[in-house]
Interface confidence: medium
Amino acid sequence: NKILVKQSPMLVAYDNAVNLSCKYSYNLFSREFRASLHKGLDSAVEVCVVYGNYSQQLQVYSKTGFNCDGKLGNESVTFYLQNLYVNQTDIYFCKIEVMYPPPYLDNEKSNGTIIHVKGKHLCPSPLFPGPSKP
């Protein structure tokens, strides 16, 4: 039995930040789980991890240098990514593993979300006329 995951097809990060919500066909409440976000078609880069279990506080971390935070719902994890670069525009996949109670469960691969990171455009400084000459 596999958990199904729903993600938005595309998100635009205008201020180099984005909220990506992963919605699961499974209730995470009172479960030990590991929710993660992966970058690239091959999911080669693990962007962010949210780990919840009974014995310690919720852990949110990235081992790959991303600035991330996580918020939980009953059947969702929302990853908040900040300080994204234009060259990090890519497809991102949500993954979920439930370790306890048995049986171990994970998800069918989702369709992913394309995150398009828009660069910050600096507005040109207004041009003031120079001092008038007599």
């Epitope: 409440f29 506080q57 919720l58 939980l72 719902g73």
Partner: nanobody, 125 residues
Framework: EVQLVESGGGLVQAGGSLRLSCAAS????????IGWFRQAPGKEREGVAC????????YYANSVKGRFTISSDNAKNTVYLQMNSLKPEDTAVYYC??????WGWGMLHMRHGDRGQGTQVTVSS
């Protein structure tokens, strides 16, 4: 010292209702989450519901969703669990526990003792 006192349990017929209360003291109530879990004889402990007092977020186990409602009265430092449409399988001792978030409160406070003594709920068929 963290103190949690549960009340409101009792014997009720299937289909009936009960309201459990968890009175908290010894910590800054608004900064914490309060959760309810239950333990029936010979069964694993089960997380039931949790409310985060900082933002009001609520969480429920599938087994009680739509029947149980958790709410918080920050002025009284009390959390309530309204239990409707009770079933015999809801029979258990109900405990409340406090933690800084809704994830992590279960076993952490079973071990460390930051939970109440429990209140017995018995649902007869």
């Amino acid at each position: 010292e963290v103190q949690l006192v549960e009340s409101g349990g009792g014997l009720v017929q299937a289909g009936g209702s009960l309201r459990l209360s968890c009175a908290a003291s010894g910590f800054t109530f608004d900064d914490y989450a309060i959760g309810w879990f239950r333990q029936a004889p010979g069964k694993e402990r089960e997380g039931v519901a949790c409310v985060s007092n900082s933002d009001g977020s609520t969480y429920y186990a599938n087994s009680v969703k739509g029947r149980f409602t958790i709410s918080s009265d920050n002025a009284k430092n009390t959390v309530y669990l309204q239990m409707n449409s009770l079933k015999p399988e809801d029979t258990a001792v109900y405990y409340c526990a406090a933690d800084s978030r809704c994830w992590g409160w279960g076993m952490l406070h079973m071990r460390h003792g930051d939970r109440g003594q429990g209140t017995q709920v018995t649902v007869s068929s």
